[in-house]
Amino acid sequence: AASCRETCCPVGPSGLRCTRAGTLNTLRGLRGAGNLTELYVENQRDLQRLEFEDLQGLGELRSLTIVKSGLRFVAPDAFHFTPRLSHLNLSSNALESLSWKTVQGLSLQDLTLSGNPLHCSCALLWLQRWEQEDLCGVYTQKLQGSGSGDQFLPLGHNNSCGVPSVKIQMPNDSVEVGDDVFLQCQVEGQALQQADWILTELEGTATMKKSGDLPSLGLTLVNVTSDLNKKNVTCWAENDVGRAEVSVQVSVSFPASVHLGKAVEQHHWCIPFSVDGQPAPSLRWFFNGSVLNETSFIFTQFLESALTNETMRHGCLRLNQPTHVNNGNYTLLAANPYGQAAASIMAAFMDNPFEFNPEDPIPVSFSPVDTNSTSRDPVEKKDETP
């Protein structure tokens, strides 16, 4: 390294050091930079800007130092191509500000900005918070106000310094399949930069038409389907302080539907069902045509669903220790204000021990069982039984 007379010289297997004064005005296209993990730049007064594509190809970079140079602008997306960057030292440059977007998405362990003429403004509120909350090793000198003798200003107490306020207005009336729905995103705040909708969850649920611009964005969902339920519609906005977003879900009403499966023996017996509808339907079970009163021996149990973005619910009519008196026809009635549906299934859990040939002796040692009961209960279980 001592004999290297290039602008930038290698340091170890994956480092590069650029310290020959006044030889660099851009970091774009550094030779042999593919596997760099460490880049050190010093005494480059003509290096004034760090732009979006300057660090392209430096995907392995972990540490970047640009010190005692002329850096006065770092683009918000300057580190787009260096997602692994963890150490950033930009001390002793000409930076007056640094956008929160610049470091968004990076897992910085330390950030050094001392020796820069940083001007106190809302755009640096994020930096002050990092320092106060010790979010990573942040090293700056006191932020300067515009007056020559101003000390560090308590930006947090400046009410005009804040991320945008975002609200989505929705229709008050119930929405039905086939309707068009208009949503309005109202944004308030200082120095608003941009705002938009995030509609990734809505594919195939409706045709989407965006309208308007800051501070009021419109979104029309044309010919909505029931698939729109439980899907997030998100509006976001950014200013120089940060980003805010809010999500809503449009509830699309549709009639109840129900499906029953064959009884299966698990740790207990289960008559599986699926119900759908919006609003969520009320459920009622019938056994051989009569209302089934649930007890700890026979009751509805919903399955925990990993899918929170659908209206369909799955569950079991759970039967603990069913006997022959529980054999029969089970009907599930699901109803909501838009309609009702029913499904039935025959279930046989155990043979009736009292079915006998008239010529067989009568089993007098057994008392008759109340065959109207629906809370009777066999089946050894391995798990805890509710």
């Epitope: 009751f299 008392s367 509710p386």
Partner: antibody, heavy 118, light 107 residues
């Protein structure tokens, strides 16, 4: 491990009401019915009723339908039994209990002694 | 409601003895019967469910038998910790009912 925690004792006046609590831990509270059992001093065990913590559905034995009210607070994993119009006959230990791996009471609270006295 | 009748109401025995407690149901409950032990001032403890399946941690000197309406709990070679009150309970639907109890005392 599964635990059902109950306060030790309650002293109440005749005609008043009392609310007994049963705080559950160590299992998924909403998946298992909670039962309540009465035991008068020197007497046997008497099932009062049951409640499904998932939806608040209740079943009572006939004689307790106007005496006991079972409720649930899902946020604190706690079951409650309110006893109203108390008389000296209501003086007893009240247990909460739940099924284990089968339909029998593998888990019991320590019981709350309710004394009805002027 | 199913009535459970337990006998005897009380029983005196010595350490090392074998004793049997019986329970009768007012109707057929198949094998859906449980037994509990209760010591003075303590909560009941499950011993047996489904007539003869021992609950976790219950010593093998306890055994249950029966079906339909007649059931029994047998304790072989009584130990000092076995003295207390024993209850049967059907688990064949709601409402659940218990026997009146059998008090097992040291002779």
């Amino acid at each position: 491990q599964v635990q059902l925690q109950q306060p030790g004792a309650e002293l109440v006046k005749p005609g008043a009401s009392v609310q007994l609590s049963c705080k559950a831990s160590g299992y998924t509270f909403t998946s298992y019915w909670i039962h309540w059992v009465k035991q008068r001093p020197g007497q046997g065990l008497e099932w009062i009723g049951e409640i499904n913590p998932n939806n608040g559905l209740t079943n009572y034995i006939e004689k307790f339908k106007n005496k006991a009210t079972l409720t649930i607070d899902k946020s604190s994993n706690t079951a409650y039994m309110q006893l109203s119009g108390l008389t000296p006959e209501d003086s007893a230990v009240y247990y909460c209990a739940k099924y284990g791996n089968y339909v029998a009471f593998a888990y019991w609270g320590q019981g709350t002694l309710v004394t009805v006295s002027a | 409601d199913i009535q459970m009748t337990q006998s005897p109401a009380s029983l005196s025995a010595s350490v090392g003895d074998t004793v049997t407690i019986t329970c009768r149901a007012s109707e057929n409950i198949y094998t859906y019967l449980a037994w509990y032990q209760q010591k003075q001032g303590k909560s009941p403890q499950l011993l047996v469910h489904n007539t003869k399946t021992l609950a976790e941690g219950v010593p093998s000197r306890f055994s249950g038998s029966g079906s339909g309406t007649q059931f029994s709990l047998k304790i072989s070679s009584l130990q000092p910790e076995d003295f207390g009150t024993y209850y049967c309970q059907h688990h064949y639907g709601v409402p659940l009912t218990f026997g009146a109890g059998t008090k097992l005392e040291l002779k």
